[in-house]
């Protein structure tokens, strides 16, 4: 059976939108009016993984691009990156673990925890125009809460 996917945009809890910053990086910044068209549209795929009451495993691809958010070790630190894939083989139900995030929705907080690196979350900085990154559980002022906006296919 084909993997179930939906198209959406994400904004952090400070209402910063996510946009491309070069070919393999996302950044978060406030957008208004026509600039909103810059924000990336994700294709969120519901994939195989450990499901629990609060966690749903998903993969986050960029719509109509063969790029997926993935989590890898760089210099011994869990790191978020955009990774190119073969569009003939992706998305798929059994995604490699580096592509899988636990979507956690509690009391209107939406978080994305790396399945590969538990306790590491997709994060944005308080500051404007900074890269989206993978942050630890004690991230201080870093933002890990998002809202999701559905986009029609």
């Amino acid at each position: 059976a084909p993997v179930r996917s939906l198209n959406c945009t994400l904004r952090d809890s400070q209402q910063k939108s996510l946009v491309m910053s070069g070919p393999y990086e996302l950044k978060a910044l406030h957008l208004q009016g026509q600039d909103m068209e810059q924000q990336v549209v994700f294709s969120m795929s519901f994939v195989q993984g450990e499901e629990s009451n609060d966690k749903i495993p998903v993969a986050l691809g960029l719509k109509e691009k063969n790029l997926y958010l993935s989590c890898v070790l760089k210099d011994d630190k869990p790191t978020l990156q955009l990774e190119s894939v073969d569009p003939k083989n992706y998305p798929k139900k059994k995604m490699e673990k580096r592509f899988v995030f636990n979507k956690i929705e509690i009391n209107n907080k939406l978080e994305f925890e790396s399945a590969q690196f538990p306790n590491w979350y997709i994060s944005t900085s308080q500051a404007e125009n900074m890269p989206v990154f993978l942050g630890g559980t004690k991230g201080g002022q870093d933002i890990t809460d998002f809202t999701m906006q559905f986009v029609s296919s």
Partner: antibody
């Protein structure tokens, strides 16, 4: 402000089922997560389990097979049932509101006064 | 299973600084919370997210965390601070909740 009040029989016979109810006043039970915690006399606090209105639950592994938690939204109450009790289940039982502060961190910000249940 | 370890008791004289420690393998990743429980009463949250103080809690209560150790500090302890103190955290893997064994603080 939100207040919690536990109620139920203070004495339960061994092998029977302990049933407790927590009544939430001053707020809606539907919008939050709720936990049960117990404290045997002279001992420390022990988390029993938590649930959310949608049916999401997490139970203490050692008690999982004996626990049932449910909710009655019309009465703004939630309940705990613990089956096959023994003297080791004698404790003060507390209900508490379970708050999520993000990044996998949960805590209890509001507690009931507690009710003593003796198994004898 | 995940455990939090506290000293069973701490004693100070009034006006002295009391420090209660809590150690646990998940504390580098998860926040520590501290509850005060006076005799015959329900626990009250005195510190959350390692070092934040809820409104209504006196400034003499503070918290810190470094590595696998969290510390509750009561600067200028008063007789009314005599109570059991429990550290608490969330198990890293499965959302199960863990309390330390409790520390009896005596102020005399």
């Amino acid at each position: 402000q939100v207040q919690l009040q536990e109620s139920g029989p203070g004495l339960v016979k061994p092998s029977e089922t302990l049933s407790l109810t927590c009544t939430v006043s001053g707020g809606s039970i539907s919008s939050d997560y709720w936990s049960w915690i117990r404290q045997p006399a002279g001992k420390g606090l022990e988390w029993i389990g938590r649930f959310y209105n949608s049916g999401r639950t997490n139970y203490r592994p050692s008690l999982k097979s004996r626990i049932t938690m449910s909710v009655d939204t019309s009465k703004n109450q939630f309940s705990l049932k613990l089956s096959s009790v023994t003297a080791a289940d004698t404790a003060v039982y507390y209900c508490a509101r379970d708050m999520y502060s993000g990044r996998g961190n949960w805590y209890f910000d509001l507690w009931g006064r507690g009710t003593l249940v003796t198994v004898s | 299973s995940y455990e939090l370890t506290q000293p069973p008791s701490v004693s100070v004289s009034p006006g002295q600084t009391a420090r209660i420690t809590c150690s646990g393998d998940a504390l580098p990743k998860k926040y520590a919370y501290w509850y005060q429980q006076k005799s015959g009463q329900a626990p009250v949250l005195v510190i959350y997210e390692d070092s934040k103080r809820p409104s209504g809690i006196p400034e003499r209560f503070s918290g810190s965390s470094s590595g696998t150790m969290a510390t509750l500090t009561i600067s200028g302890a008063q007789v009314e601070d005599e109570a059991d103190y429990y550290c608490y955290s969330t198990d890293s893997s499965d959302n199960h909740r863990v309390f330390g064994g409790g520390t009896k603080l005596t102020v005399l």
